[in-house]
């Protein structure tokens, strides 16, 4: 592959439907603008979950209505996905693009399998 991107193989979402994982990339040079995209692969379909572009040294900002939040530190991005339900179980791929300065570098992680288990409803108490 092109740029190396590492992410954990498996993550278990919390009972509140929150999953966090680190996406780490090996930058060939000194990028100042980085774009991180989370993709979900289910069967052969790939859909974009969320994306953020950030300047190195600045905070990672997703859109207000995004289910993702994140922080960056050097070549590491700490990603959190919230609002997950059992049906969202799947492979979540981290895509990293070094946008500026040229040249453009692209890296795709192998994916993190996120398991989501819906909490059991609390039994009625008499």
């Amino acid at each position: 592959k092109a740029m190396h991107v590492a992410q954990p193989a498996v993550v278990l979402a919390s009972s509140r439907g929150i999953a966090s994982f680190v996406c780490e990339y090996a930058s060939p040079g000194k990028a100042t603008e980085v774009r991180v995209t989370v993709l979900r692969q289910a069967d052969s379909q790939v859909t974009e979950v969320c994306a953020a572009t950030y300047m190195m040294g600045n905070e990672l900002t997703f859109l207000d209505d995004s289910i993702c939040t994140g922080t960056s530190s050097g070549n590491q991005v700490n990603l959190t996905i919230q609002g997950l339900r059992a049906m969202d179980t799947g492979l979540y791929i981290c895509k990293v693009e070094l946008m500026y300065p040229p040249p453009y570098y692209l890296g795709i992680g192998n994916g993190t399998q996120i398991y989501v288990i819906d909490p059991e409803p609390c039994p009625d108490s008499d």
Epitope: K1, A2, H4, A26, S27, P28, G29, K30, L39, V46, I93, K95, E97, M99, P102, P103, Y104, Y105, L106, I108
Partner: antibody
Framework: EVQLVESGGGLVQPGGSLRLSCAAS????????MNWVRQAPGKGLEWLAQ??????????YYSASVKGRFTISRDDSKNSVYLQMNSLKTEDTGVYYC??????WGQGTLVTVSS | DIQMTQSPSSLSASVGDRVTITCRTS??????LNWYQRKPGKSPKLLIY???NLASGVSSRFSGSGSGTDYTLTISSLQPEDVATYYC?????????FGSGTKLEIK
């Protein structure tokens, strides 16, 4: 201003060897992966080889058409990348370009393999 | 290896026309696609990187779109200086294959 200047092209007989050079300036050479691309007469662009940089342990990659015959190398102290071409064939004739990860391109150098 | 299928191989259009060139890949390349312009006797020039991003100094007439396996280069209003051969390229992984090219001419 970014500049990539290729040299070393020329006429060579089939089976012969040639070493191409590419001198870079105007950007941080050591931060970049370098590639060689060629265009044969009347044909399209063909990627040949890539050499990555120190963070990537100077890994090299080749197209199937040149693997085992061509060798890419670089000298970061001289801001230069090279292509050693051995066992040349008539179909290796073309214009050879060096490129910094496809963003910046040289003007090309013509290689002619003919008896 | 990733195969690149570019179409059409040649195209003739009038000044002011909207022109589209397509590139289909044999597998998902996650937007890892560049577009180049090559004029006779000149070096290739990067137009679009990462499928949708306009390279520095390139006219906004050019735009790129697509994802997965299907990508498009669009020239919104063809100009005489756009006569050239256009190539797509996979930049996701080695070998960094190019498409076969589209030769664009003015009617």
């Amino acid at each position: 201003e970014v500049q990539l200047v290729e040299s070393g092209g020329g006429l060579v007989q089939p089976g012969g060897s040639l070493r191409l050079s590419c001198a870079a300036s105007g950007f941080t050479f050591s931060d970049n992966w370098m590639n060689w691309v060629r265009q044969a007469p009347g044909k399209g662009l063909e990627w040949l080889a890539q050499i990555r940089n120190k963070p990537y342990n100077y890994e090299t990659y080749y197209s199937a058409s040149v693997k085992g015959r061509f060798t890419i190398s670089r000298d970061d102290s001289k801001n230069s990348v090279y292509l050693q071409m051995n066992s040349l064939k008539t179909e290796d004739t073309g214009v050879y370009y060096c490129t910094a990860q496809f963003a910046y391109w040289g003007q090309g150098t013509l290689v002619t393999v003919s008896s | 290896d990733i195969q690149m299928t570019q179409s059409p191989s040649s195209l003739s259009a009038s000044v002011g026309d909207r022109v589209t060139i397509t590139c289909r890949t044999s597998e998902n390349i996650y937007g890892g696609l560049n577009w180049y312009q090559r004029k006779p006797g000149k070096s290739p020039k990067l137009l679009i990187y990462g499928a949708t991003n306009l390279a520095s100094g390139v006219s906004s007439r050019f735009s790129g779109s697509g994802s997965g396996t299907d990508y498009t280069l669009t020239i919104s209003s063809l100009q005489p200086e756009d006569v050239a051969t256009y190539y797509c390229q996979n930049v996701l992984r080695s070998p960094f294959t190019f498409g076969s090219g589209t030769k664009l001419e003015i009617k």
